[in-house]
């Protein structure tokens, strides 16, 4: 799996999970989230050569096409596979609200 | 939807469905498929700016992060959303075989 256990341990040009910490105020200009101040969002990036974690038959065919025709601009892309939610605390007036935002943290990647 | 009806009608730099016809013999070097000789595989490509068909909360956050921090290398990617199968005819010896290959044709795209 192209997850932290594999990707953060290996030097990898190919599609893999990359660490990304987002500070809500500094990086997004958000002041409305009280806690946490930021989170490990992570992201997916890297090349998708033949058979590198192909998600569908189309991505397998496309990576084969791209290998045989390297001048072609059509190739699969490295995107999130498994995502997890993030629990945040914010205020409406003086009333605290706890909310779980779905699909906020990338845990693994794939070529799609 | 970023499908043929929209994407093939509009000149679009952003994430959209792109036409791609794959000739099995010429483009993949395959002689084993008897029919069809090729097919409209299509592919997804283009930029994923803020709110352009974001697939998840993470991709929305990432596109916002990328807008505010344009020097960052983290951004969503344009990938297939809806896929359809392709029915092929091939031979094993002199015996014809019909098989449906799932997820071979891209019908629409998303930023993920």
């Amino acid at each position: 799996a192209l997850d932290a256990a594999y990707c953060f341990r290996n030097v990898q040009d190919n599609c893999c999970l990359r660490p990304l910490y987002i500070d809500f105020k500094r990086d997004l200009g958000w002041k409305w989230i009280h806690e946490p101040k930021g989170y490990n969002a992570n992201f997916c990036a890297g090349a998708c050569p033949y058979l590198w974690s192909s998600d569908t038959q189309h991505s397998r065919v496309l990576s084969l096409y791209n290998t045989i025709n390297p001048e072609a601009s059509a190739s699969p892309c490295c995107v999130s596979q498994d995502l997890e939610p993030l629990t945040i605390l914010y205020y409406i007036g003086k009333t605290p609200k706890i909310e779980q935002l779905s699909n906020m943290i990338v845990k693994s990647c794939k070529c799609s | 939807a970023l499908d043929a009806a929209y994407c093939f009608r509009n000149v679009q730099d952003n994430c959209c469905l792109r036409p791609l016809y794959i000739d099995f013999k010429r483009d993949l070097g395959w002689k084993w498929i008897h029919e069809p000789k090729g097919y409209n595989a299509n592919f997804c490509a283009g930029a994923c700016p803020y709110l352009w068909s974001s697939d998840t909360q993470h991709s929305r956050v990432l596109s916002l992060y990328n807008t505010i921090n344009p020097e960052a290398s983290a951004s969503p990617c344009c990938v297939s959303q809806d896929l359809e199968p392709l029915t092929i005819l091939y031979y094993i010896g002199k015996t014809p075989k019909i098989e449906q290959l799932s997820n071979m044709i891209v019908k629409s795209c998303k930023c993920s």
């Epitope: 038959q57 397998r60 | 013999k25 993949l28 070097g29 098989e99 290959l101």
Partner: nanobody, 120 residues
Amino acid sequence: QLQLVESGGGLVQPGGSLRLSCTASGSTFEIYPIYAMAWFRQTPGKQRELVALTTDVKTNYADSVKGRFTISRDNAKNTVYLQMNMLQPEDTAVYVCNVGVVRGGLQNYWGQGTQVTVSS
């Protein structure tokens, strides 16, 4: 039971040659079409690299091996070969073969790998 068996690896001096073989056994390879055969190589701590690939009428090579390596296949023997000439120390790796078979979709099978060491 479907199996890929590689052979031909070993220790060779720089400038030397080796011929790797990968034979596919098991009924799957006799019953279903093969859509691609390929050789990859893996070195510790580095990513798996596609070395050479062949389909029915197309071949492709990594830039680093072009002009030195040749991939070929013998359909009757269900075997794919990798002829490696002018070997260099940077070619040292575990070489793994992969066979793509059309079996309820595009399925891929991996061998166990064979070690190639180029050293004087």
